[in-house]
């Protein structure tokens, strides 16, 4: 057993059937010292008398939150909450796997740059009773501080099967140094509490291997004289770090035609135009990597041939 | 880049841009990582390994104010490397072809260090990768942890010779 | 083409030392190690040592630890063993082999000790 | 160390038949294996490495199977130079080891 918080207890119970659970003290936070009964909002039975009381957590039914009081004066709540572990992993009920780019990825993270700045999300069918809270670092043995935000309920989708809720965070290292090479991981461990379950999840990575820059601005299209080429002009995106002779990007441009199956092959340019070949009715779409590491391509941006 | 002399910024752009690719295109051939356990992956890649690190000015501020110290890491990098990638975790078995990415990359490896650092100016003694002969079954790990590991030092080294080029350039 | 050439036979007293050349051509010599393997009369296949010529990195077999010595001269692309102590057991085929699973072997070395 | 016993240590056979020589080891060397056949007086020959692949230029009729400490060679059709004394090795940790060979007789 552990503290989550403040009168907040995890009990870690090897789930199986007949399992012989956990024994757990709870001690009333109180200066009283008799006259203290307990119970628990699974019934409102007393469970016990003093200022400790010791119960058997085997299920969910033995969860839940323990109340010590003084006569009809409260003194103090314990929640316990249940972490399961099944044929020795951890349950991961609560969260959706997202499959990519492996299983088991419960949680994924982006950043648009080198800032020290990025969003993970996570995806789960329930909506109600459900709380999350996220904490980060860098490094494991002597950690260096991350800063997150409040997880946010982003989206919500719903399809023929189920509902889909999709809640995100975000963070900011406090000290980043965007022109470094990494060499601690940055850790994110997500708390996810459902009713009376309790589970974690965490990932890991360096900032280098979750950058996707947002998709080129500005994408601009220039008949050329007298040719069916065009030239086509873009600009780095806003977010992307600066300056840009340092964190320099790589460009790819494709021509699509109507039917959209059909797409010529890819022209990379580390400039920032390139000169193609336009029909009527295609489009020319455009995306932007790192130059110098094979991290994710961002997202196309278009520009219409007509 | 003896006393306060400055590098080649264009050729050494050309050569680090072209390090990047061989890297990259170096990764695929290390053979199914499913077969390996990422055992103690934490942070043993970094274990002596010459990271370019916050302090050592390869930003574009440090890069402004004093190329030196910033070009003294990039080069204790390339020998590390470049010593890691002739011991027998890549010499030996499972065999790499001697002319596919590995091999290029050795070489460009010291070609990028031979830039930096003209015949006859050994100034200092670099750090040197403790060298135990490996195992062939440790070896496709510790090449992939070793290529990835090589691949970050490598976009760093890039982006200070880019904006060399573009910025300190004579 | 890529070949390992060895040298000639020889033979040798008890208590002295032989030294096997193996010349390779072919290949980058510093790209693979060189390992070497002896073959009694009428007997297995054991293994002695490698080397790495890259950084002259050596690696014996417990056996032989003490009386090989495997070395390499980069300039001229060969790779050495030299077996001291000769003992009439001593007496084998020697080949040089470069990585196990790249196919390349010396034609052998016969080496007699006798008395 | 890891011991390789390779059997049968000898075995007869026809032109034609199937022949299949096996190979264990004492402790898990996943697919670092490799097959040799030797004739007498020449250098061994690599047939099969990494358990499975065929060397470049060795007829198909090779061919090589197994996983962690039980291998096989097996020849599908005996022909006339298949005649010699096979090995395999593992490569899997130093001391590199070798079976003590199969030689395959006409029958």
């Known amino acids: 057993i552990w503290e989550l918080e403040k009168d907040v207890y995890v009990v870690e119970l090897d789930w199986y059937p007949d399992a012989p659970g956990e024994t757990v003290v709870l001690t009333c936070d109180t200066s009283e010292e008799d006259g203290i009964t307990w119970t628990s909002e699974q019934s409102n039975k007393v469970l016990g008398s003093g200022k400790t009381l010791t119960i058997l957590v085997k299920e969910f039914g033995d969860a839940g939150q323990y109340t010590c009081h003084k006569g009809d004066k409260v003194l103090g709540h314990s929640k316990v909450l249940l972490h399961k572990k099944e044929d020795g992993i951890w349950s991961t009920d609560i969260l959706k796997d997202q499959k990519e780019p492996k299983s088991k990825t419960f949680l994924k993270c982006e950043a648009k740059n080198y800032s020290g700045h990025f969003t993970c999300w996570w995806l789960t069918a329930i909506s109600r009773d459900v709380k999350f809270s996220v904490k980060s670092n860098r490094g494991s043995s002597d950690p260096q501080g991350v800063t997150c935000g409040v997880p946010t309920l982003s989206a919500e989708r719903v399809s023929v099967d189920h509902t889909e809720y999709k809640f995100s965070v975000e963070c900011q290292e406090d000290n980043a140094c965007p022109a470094a090479e990494e060499s601690l991981h940055l850790e994110v461990m997500l708390d996810a509490i459902h009713k009376l379950k309790y589970e974690n999840y965490t990932s890991s990575f360096f900032i280098r291997d979750i950058v996707k820059p947002d998709p080129p601005q500005n994408l601009q299209m220039k008949p050329l004289k007298n040719s069916r080429h065009v030239e086509v002009s873009w600009e780095y995106p806003d977010t992307w770090s600066t300056p840009h002779s340092y964190f320099s990007l790589t460009f790819c441009v494709q021509v699509q035609n109507k039917n959209k199956k059909e797409k010529k092959d890819r022209l990379c340019v580390d400039k920032t135009s390139a000169t193609v070949m336009c029909h009527k009715d295609a489009k020319i779409r455009v995306q932007a990597r790192d130059r110098y590491y094979s991290s994710s391509w961002s997202e196309w941006a278009f520009v219409s041939c007509n | 880049v003896p006393g306060d002399s400055s590098p080649a910024w264009t050729q050494c752009q050309q050569l680090s841009q072209k390090l990047c690719t061989l890297a990259w295109s170096a990764h695929p051939q290390m053979g199914p990582m499913e077969l390996l356990r990422e055992e103690g992956d934490e942070e043993t890649t970094s274990d002596d390994v010459p990271h370019i690190q916050c302090e050592d000015g390869c930003d574009p501020q440090g890069l402004r104010d004093n190329t030196q110290f910033c070009l003294q890491r990039i080069r204790q990098g390339l020998f590390f490397y470049e010593k890691l990638l002739g011991s027998d975790i890549f010499t030996g078995e499972p065999a790499l072809l001697p002319d596919g990415p590995v091999g290029q990359l050795h070489a460009s490896l010291l070609g990028l260090s031979q830039l930096l650092q003209p015949e006859g100016h050994h100034r200092e003694t670099p750090q040197t990768p403790s060298l135990h002969p490996s195992q062939p079954w440790q070896r496709r790990l510790l090449r992939f942890k070793i290529l990835r590991s090589l691949q970050a030092f490598l976009a760093v080294a890039a982006r200070v010779f880019a904006h060399g080029a573009a910025t300190l350039s004579p | 083409q890529v070949q390992l050439v060895q040298s000639g036979a020889e033979v040798k007293k008890p208590g002295s030392s032989v030294k096997v050349s193996c010349k390779a051509s072919?290949?980058?010599?510093?790209?693979?190690?060189m390992h070497w393997v002896r073959q009694a009369p009428g007997q297995g296949l054991e293994w002695m040592g490698y080397i790495n010529p890259y950084n002259d990195g050596t690696n014996y077999n417990e056996k032989f630890k003490g009386r090989v010595t495997i070395t390499a001269d980069k300039s001229t692309s060969t790779a050495y063993m030299e077996l001291s102590s000769l003992r009439s057991e001593d007496t084998a085929v020697y080949y040089c082999?470069?990585?196990?699973?790249?196919?390349?072997w010396g034609q052998g070395t016969t080496v007699t000790v006798s008395s | 160390d890891i011991q390789m016993t390779q059997s049968p240590s000898s075995l007869s056979a026809s032109v034609g038949d199937r022949v299949t020589i096996t190979c264990k080891a004492s402790?898990?060397?996943?697919?670092?294996l490799t097959w040799y056949q030797q004739k007498p007086g020449k250098a061994p020959k690599l047939l099969i490495y990494g358990a499975t692949s065929l060397e470049t230029g060795v007829p198909s009729r090779f061919s090589g199977s197994g996983s962690g400490t039980d291998f096989t060679l097996t020849i599908s059709s005996l022909q006339p130079e298949d005649f010699a004394t096979y090995y395999c090795?593992?490569?899997?940790?130093?001391?590199?080891?070798f079976g003590g060979g199969t030689k395959v007789e006409i029958k």
């Open positions: 072919g290949y980058k010599f510093t790209r693979y190690v």
């Open positions: 402790d898990h060397i996943l697919k670092f």
């Open positions: 082999a470069r990585n196990w699973d790249t196919g390349l």
């Open positions: 090795q593992m490569y899997w940790s130093t001391p590199f080891t």
